[in-house]
């Protein structure tokens, strides 16, 4: 039994890091393998993660961690029984994938303005709480070409757009994702999408 693709890990910069790797053949990850991990810190202890299968030869492990700070470094040991298959380390702050925003809501009752709001996925004491920016994706269910992205570069988790920038009388969907420039993170997954029917009063033409 050998590791074909070494573990790569990403952290949500809160409490979970996810590590994925591939073996050289079909493997029952949960029965054959264990990933041991430990924060390099005087007051830390070793933890064991039981991996799950992720395709025939792929394995994935969800590591429960202490609140992350930038200096954290974890040792990783992948074991098959008594055999050490791979040894490495992981700095969560260097491989961050933020949590997805939640509670996306479209408020349509504000005088021909659409107000989209969502929740910051981090608590206020987390470093990323004040460092997230967002991308909002809006698309038409009727017209695949009607697809747009709004970049929200301010901290407030909301977006205002004129309803008239979208077509009236049809249904739209929206979703939002986040990233943090300070740690050069990847984008989060998209939030679940929300649907609304776009309608607004056309302004009277003045002759």
């Amino acid at each position: 039994m050998k590791v074909l693709q070494e573990p790569t890990c990403v952290s949500d910069y809160m409490s979970i890091s996810t590590c994925e790797w591939k073996m050289n053949g079909p493997t029952n990850c949960s029965t054959e393998l264990r990933l041991l991990y430990q924060l390099v810190f005087l007051l830390s202890e070793a933890h064991t993660c039981i991996p799950e299968n992720n395709g025939g030869a792929g394995c994935v492990c969800h590591l429960l961690m202490d609140d992350v700070v930038s200096a954290d470094n974890y040792t990783l040991d992948l074991w098959a029984g008594q055999q050490l298959l791979w040894k490495g380390s992981f700095k969560p702050s260097e491989h961050v994938k933020p949590r997805a925003p939640g509670n996306l809501t479209v408020h349509t009752n504000v005088s021909d303005t659409l107000l989209l709001t969502w929740s910051n996925p981090y608590p206020p004491d987390n470093y990323l709480y004040n460092h997230l920016t967002y991308a909002v994706n809006i698309w038409s269910e009727n017209d695949p070409a009607d697809f747009r992205i709004y970049n929200v570069t301010y901290l407030e988790p909301s977006l205002r757009i004129a309803a008239s920038t979208l077509k009236s009388g049809i249904s739209y969907r929206a979703r939002v994702r986040a990233w943090a420039q300070c740690y050069n993170t990847t984008w989060s997954e998209w939030s679940p999408s929300t649907k609304w029917h776009n309608s607004y009063r056309e302004p009277f033409e003045q002759h």
């Epitope: 409490s15 390099v40 810190f41 005087l42 007051l43 830390s44 202890e45 961690m65 202490d66 609140d67 700070v69 930038s70 200096a71 954290d72 608590p123 206020p124 004491d125």
Partner: antibody, heavy 115, light 109 residues
Framework: EVQLVQSGGGLVHPGGSLRLSCAGS????????MFWVRQAPGKGLEWVSG???????SYADSVKGRFTISRDNAKNSLYLQMNSLRAEDMAVYYC?????????WGQGTLVTVSS | EIVLTQSPGTLSLSPGERATLSCRAS???????LAWYQQKPGQAPRLLIF???SRAPGIPDRFSGSGSGTDFTLTISRLEPEDFAVYYC??????????FGQGTKVEIK
Amino acid sequence: EVQLVQSGGGLVHPGGSLRLSCAGSGFTFSRNAMFWVRQAPGKGLEWVSGIGTGGATSYADSVKGRFTISRDNAKNSLYLQMNSLRAEDMAVYYCARGRYYFDYWGQGTLVTVSS
Amino acid sequence: EIVLTQSPGTLSLSPGERATLSCRASQSVSSSYLAWYQQKPGQAPRLLIFGASSRAPGIPDRFSGSGSGTDFTLTISRLEPEDFAVYYCQQYDHSAGWTFGQGTKVEIK
């Protein structure tokens, strides 16, 4: 807002015991290492003890064998049991959250050791 | 055990002046594990700088940290009246734990 609220200081005779408490709020207590740091009157800061999320502990040589740090994650609380107290243990004791450094501190509680 | 020595013991300056505080370690310290604190009379210490040069949340940008190895510096670019206090450096070591410097008092001249 992260808050650490301390209680339990007071006057104790040499050789006596005292228990300090620290209640945390505004953060996930169970995922953070916690510490005690003290400051003798007119002196600098001295690290006393720390406890990790899994219960691993460490002590300054000056208190080893006399002080015991503990935590109760269900109550979001940190404790310091101080036995065989000496005159040189007299100080303001601070609880703190942190790891390699201490990012939030309690208000401090004075421990006076005097006969 | 790593010993941190701060200098000067006392720094007498006027508001608006630049303050430069030194922290020297008896052996090499990882920059990731060097922090600075401010303490005012009757108050708990407040984290200013971590990782030798990163400002803690809410700390004004007139505070900056620098250095590596055994020599670290805290600089206050323009002293405000509320900056007069005692400043401590602190390091963490995987075997010895946490140690503080003896402090530098910044007082009004």
